[in-house]
């Protein structure tokens, strides 16, 4: 019998390389049974996520699984760093893993740091 | 059923590019993560590094990390190893393992492994 | 590098004897998320690795439950409780927390 918790299916130690200025789209995937719950988004400052009020999200719907998104219209320098979904359930919180987003500021890149370059940054990574 | 199946040259010369392939026939790999991972012959195992298939980022061991390139083909399920430059060794089995999603995140499933050599 | 320390190197036991195979981590395996990313693996000749533990106490399905796994931090435990012929093999722990990936070097069950 398949479980009927909700579940956030962000990978865990997961990593999006971004530019400013593009338009960029934050997924959270949620699985949940009868009821969807209601999910927001926090942005990580240290070991605090802190909640993010008034930005615009919206649900997409596919197959087996919902998709709650953040999005970034556009993108800003500021919004480098790392994220995490958050469910409520039956009066329970539920976390997904945090993912990391590497903004590259187009002024100052002369060129694309490569994938793996970025996500060696120490100082970005939480988890 | 997972089912990964490295394959590639069993033979590279010296100062060659080693270079396998790795498809998995039994998940799709943009829901996983893919990993490398190497053993000499009579040794331990060494982790090469891994790709997030959905996105491409890669995540690779310093040790080897000036030499090697993991990518994947979302389109093929399937994720490629290079390693350049090689040396005596760099003779190894080499795996390639799917990491498990929520909640475990450990390496589950793995390919038969692919022996290469390096010799001239 | 976390540098992950197996003891023993290898070990010879008797059919019915219980084995213990130590890990040491360099540093704490407890991820920021609360869990414990350690992992133990059987490999046997001429074969992948086999996952048997993960999370540092869950038995994989299918695994035998003389096989057991404990620890924190950086002190691990794989203990077989009654050793059988099938499990001469070269156990590994693995931590799954810290970039990049470790391995133990390995420790080598034999029969006596």
């Known amino acids: 019998k398949e479980s009927c918790d909700v579940q956030l299916y962000i990978k865990r130690q997961s990593y999006h390389s971004i530019f400013a200025g593009d338009p960029f789209k934050l997924e959270c995937p949620v699985k949940y049974c009868a009821h969807r719950p209601q999910v927001t988004w926090c942005k990580l400052n240290g070991t605090t996520c802190v909640k993010l009020e008034g930005r615009h999200t919206s649900w997409k719907q596919e197959k087996n699984l919902s998709f709650f998104i953040l999005h970034f219209e556009p993108v800003l320098p500021s919004d480098n760093g790392s994220y995490r979904c958050s469910a409520n359930f039956l009066s329970a919180i539920i976390e997904s893993h945090s993912t990391t987003l590497y903004v590259t500021d187009v002024k100052s890149a002369s060129e694309r740091p490569s994938k793996d370059e970025m996500a060696s940054r120490p100082w970005l990574l939480y988890s | 059923q997972v089912q990964l199946q490295e394959s590639g040259p069993g033979l590279v010369k010296p100062s060659g590019t080693l270079s396998l392939t790795c498809a998995d026939s039994?998940?799709?790999?943009?829901?996983?993560?893919i990993h490398w991972v190497r053993q000499p012959p009579g040794k331990g195992l060494e982790w090469i590094g891994r790709i997030d298939p959905a996105n491409g980022f890669t995540r690779y061991n310093p040790s080897l990390k000036s030499r090697v390139t993991i990518s994947s083909d979302k389109s093929k399920n399937q994720a490629s190893l290079k390693l350049s430059s090689v040396t005596a060794a760099d003779t190894a089995v080499y795996y390639c393992?799917?990491?498990?999603?929520?909640?475990?995140?450990?390496?589950?499933?793995w390919g038969q492994g692919t022996t290469v050599t390096v010799s001239s | 590098d976390i540098v992950m320390t197996q003891s023993p190197d290898s070990l010879a036991l008797s059919l019915g004897e219980r084995a213990t195979i130590n890990c040491k981590s360099s540093q704490s395996l407890l991820d920021v998320d609360g869990k414990t990313y350690l992992n133990w693996f059987q490999q046997k000749p001429g074969q992948p690795p086999k996952r048997l533990i993960y999370l540092v106490s869950k038995l994989d399905s299918g695994v035998p439950d003389r096989f057991s796994g404990s620890g924190s931090g950086t002190d691990f435990t794989l203990t077989i409780s009654s050793v059988q012929a099938e499990d001469v093999a070269v156990y590994y722990c693995w931590q799954g927390t810290h970039f990049p990936r470790t391995f133990g070097q390995g420790t080598k069950l034999e029969i006596k």
């Open positions: 039994g998940f799709n790999i943009k829901d996983t993560y």
């Open positions: 393992a799917r990491e498990d999603g929520y909640p475990y995140y450990t390496l589950d499933s």
